[in-house]
Each structure stands twice: as structure tokens, then as C-alpha cells.
């Protein structure tokens, strides 16, 4: 199995650790971990194109989209590879993350290693917002925290 980790940090109180594991090269990726310091509710959760945090989370670029698709939800066929939907923070501002995704990979053309994981200010509307921004970002707003996805020990 391939194991990968991402430490999320931002300018504010949001921080977290997210783990990824893929047992087979064409199998699903398990994503789990915890993010704290969020406001209660839904927050967009995406893999972005670049593993570049030199200017903070903005330098991570747009959602990882090697198939020239529009934004969607993780269960949609019409989605960016990096579209992992939302995480949900409780009243204490903690989001316990547990996702299984069959589109991202830890190898091959959809490999997310070396790219940036971002948690956003607002809920991702999963491409259903009815405006142009929805088809690009899901109207998820600013980038609260991010980290480069790297190979774990």
C-alpha cells in the first residue's frame, strides 16, 4: 500500500493532518484525518494543481483537472480529479475527515502526490450553483489552509 500525508496550515487558526492510503494502484484512495479551527458547517475540500505554497495557498493554482472537465462533486462523473467535496466541522470547529475516492490516485495520471490539498472558507456547491464560478470552484471561497501532499514513512 502507498501511504501519503498532508499537513494543513494557513494564516489563521485552521490546521490539520490528512492521511491518504491506496492499497492497489487502480483501487480507491482512503482519505482520513482531522482539521481544527474551522467555523461550524461545510467547507470545500480540494486537491489543487501545484505543490507550490511560496505565496501561501494562492500559489497552488486551480483544482487539479487533467481531464479538462468542469467542477463537480466527488460522486459526479463531471468533476475535476481534485474535487473531494466538503468536510463538515462540528460546533467546536473540528472536521473529522473520512473519505473514499476512486478518481484521485497515488500513482499514474491522476496522482495527487506533490500537489496541494486545500480546505476552503465556504461550502462547495458541487457545481450546482448556477453561476460560472460554480463550474470552476463550487463557490467555495478563500483558501483557509493548505499543504503539499507528500509520501509518508
Amino acid at each position: 500500500a502507498t501511504k501519503v500525508v498532508c499537513v494543513l496550515k494557513g494564516d489563521g487558526p485552521v490546521q490539520g493532518i490528512i492521511n491518504f492510503e491506496q492499497k492497489e494502484s487502480n483501487g480507491p484512495v482512503k482519505v482520513w484525518g482531522s482539521i481544527k479551527g474551522l467555523t461550524e458547517g461545510l467547507h470545500g475540500f480540494h486537491v489543487h494543481e501545484f505543490g507550490d505554497n511560496t505565496a501561501g495557498c494562492t500559489s497552488a493554482g486551480p483544482h487539479f483537472n487533467p481531464l479538462s472537465r468542469k467542477h463537480g462533486g466527488p460522486k459526479d462523473e463531471e468533476r475535476h480529479v481534485g474535487d473531494l467535496g466538503n468536510v463538515t466541522a462540528d460546533k467546536d470547529g473540528v472536521a473529522d475527515v473520512s473519505i473514499e475516492d476512486s478518481v484521485i490516485s497515488l500513482s499514474g495520471d491522476h496522482c495527487i502526490i506533490g500537489r496541494t490539498l486545500v480546505v476552503h472558507e465556504k461550502a462547495d456547491d458541487l457545481g450546482k450553483g448556477g453561476n460560472e464560478e460554480s463550474t470552476k470552484t463550487g463557490n467555495a471561497g478563500s483558501r483557509l489552509a493548505c499543504g503539499v501532499i507528500g509520501i509518508a514513512q
Epitope: 494543481e49 501545484f50 493554482g61 486551480p62 483537472n65 481531464l67 479538462s68 472537465r69 468542469k70 462523473e77 463531471e78 460560472e132 470552476k136
Partner: antibody, heavy 116, light 107 residues
């Protein structure tokens, strides 16, 4: 290997119609947005239309809205462009391309000439 | 509509040269920019998307950079097969638009 092969171009009079086809192979056609992009002789590239993988959404550049219709048949791995009320300014090589927002790979193109 | 200005429209260079092609937008497009190469009588080929991501199979001598309104395609060491016309394209805002092209010719 991805292959896109356009056909259906030719000479047509102003006001006439043509239907372009694009046969796709080498990839899962039903999983991709597809687009038509045109290039007038000696000119640059102009995006014309695109269609969602399941055919449920289409977008058009303003200059062809109401005259051109993009469609697809996923069972036949085929993309189409029905062009009605053709004008001289529609004269171009028409390319089909994979993708809905940026484009590639592309077919070799088919020439449409609108002239009396 | 987002208007795009590519410069120069014609660029003369020699093999081994490093060349840059500029693409300027009428408004910011974040990182939603692609670059294409077209050889005479052939279809365009995508080189780069998302400003700087090389499409599979594209040689590493091609690179892209920029953000907001100003973007650059760089070819670090020109090869004979690189003499062609290059187009930028924005996919930030509908309708998707292309630059007018830069013809790269042998000096």
C-alpha cells in the same frame, strides 16, 4: 492512441446547411466533454461549441447561437455539428477536440467553404 | 468577453535560442490558461494547461508562467521542430478565447 477523425465538410451556398461528424477512438468517449473549434483560412483559432459527456449541456459562441447545434451519440463514439443558415464568415477548417475548457487532442479538421 | 493580446505576432530565432512569447488578458483569469502549438497544415496540439502544467509527452524545454493578466510561454533551447505558430487560450470566462497567435520562424 486517441484518434479523432472529422468528416462532412465541403462547399455550400450561403443560407445552406451542413452536418459535420467526428469519429472518436482510443479513449472512453462517453466520459469526456467534447468541443468544436474552427480556424478561418490564414487566421487564428475560435472556439465554437462544446457538449457535456452525457449530452445534457451545450455551450456556443454567440456568433453561432441559434444556427449551429452540437450533439453526440455515445453508443457510436461520435460527435456532430449541425450547421444551418451558413454565412461566408463561417468558412473555416472545423476541428473536433477532446475536452470542454482546454482542448486536446484534436482531429485533423474538415474544411467548410460557404460561397455562392 | 476576455480579449487576449499575444506578442510578438512574428518572432525570428535560431535553433538553440531561448525564446519567450507573451499573452496579456483584458482582465484577470487566475490560472486558467493553456498554450497550443500548430504546424502548417496540421491541427493544434496542447502544450500546457493551468498556466504551467505540461501535457503528457511535451518536452521539458517548454514552460509556462504568469498569473492574473500576464502570462509567458518559454522555449528554453529551440529545436528545429519548434518552428510553428503558438496560441494562448483562456478558459476562465465564457466564451473561451484564443490569442491571435505568434509565428515562430527560423532567422
Amino acid at each position: 492512441e486517441v484518434q479523432l477523425v472529422e468528416s462532412g465538410g465541403g462547399l455550400v451556398q450561403p443560407g445552406g446547411s451542413l452536418r459535420l461528424s467526428c469519429a472518436a477512438s482510443g479513449f472512453t468517449f462517453s466520459s469526456f466533454w467534447m468541443s468544436w473549434v474552427r480556424q478561418a483560412p490564414g487566421k487564428g483559432l475560435e472556439w465554437v461549441a462544446n457538449i457535456k459527456h452525457d449530452g445534457s449541456e451545450q455551450d456556443y459562441v454567440d456568433s453561432v447561437k441559434g444556427r449551429f447545434t452540437i450533439s453526440r451519440d455515445n453508443a457510436k463514439n461520435s460527435l456532430y455539428l449541425q450547421m444551418n443558415s451558413l454565412r461566408a464568415e463561417d468558412t473555416a477548417v472545423y476541428y473536433c477536440a477532446r475536452g470542454g475548457i482546454w482542448f486536446g487532442p484534436w482531429g485533423q479538421g474538415t474544411l467548410v467553404t460557404v460561397s455562392s | 468577453v476576455i480579449w487576449m493580446t499575444q506578442s510578438p505576432s512574428l518572432l525570428s530565432a535560431s535553433t538553440g535560442d531561448r525564446v519567450t512569447i507573451s499573452c496579456r488578458m483584458s482582465q484577470g483569469i487566475s490560472s486558467y490558461l493553456a498554450w497550443y502549438q500548430q504546424k502548417p497544415g496540421k491541427a493544434p496540439e496542447v502544450l500546457i494547461y493551468a498556466v504551467s502544467t505540461l501535457q503528457s509527452g511535451v518536452p521539458s524545454r517548454f514552460s509556462g508562467s504568469g498569473s492574473g493578466t500576464d502570462f509567458t510561454l518559454t522555449i528554453s533551447c529551440l529545436q528545429s521542430e519548434d518552428f510553428a505558430t503558438y496560441y494562448c487560450q483562456q478558459y476562465y470566462s465564457f466564451p473561451y478565447t484564443f490569442g491571435q497567435g505568434t509565428k515562430l520562424e527560423i532567422k
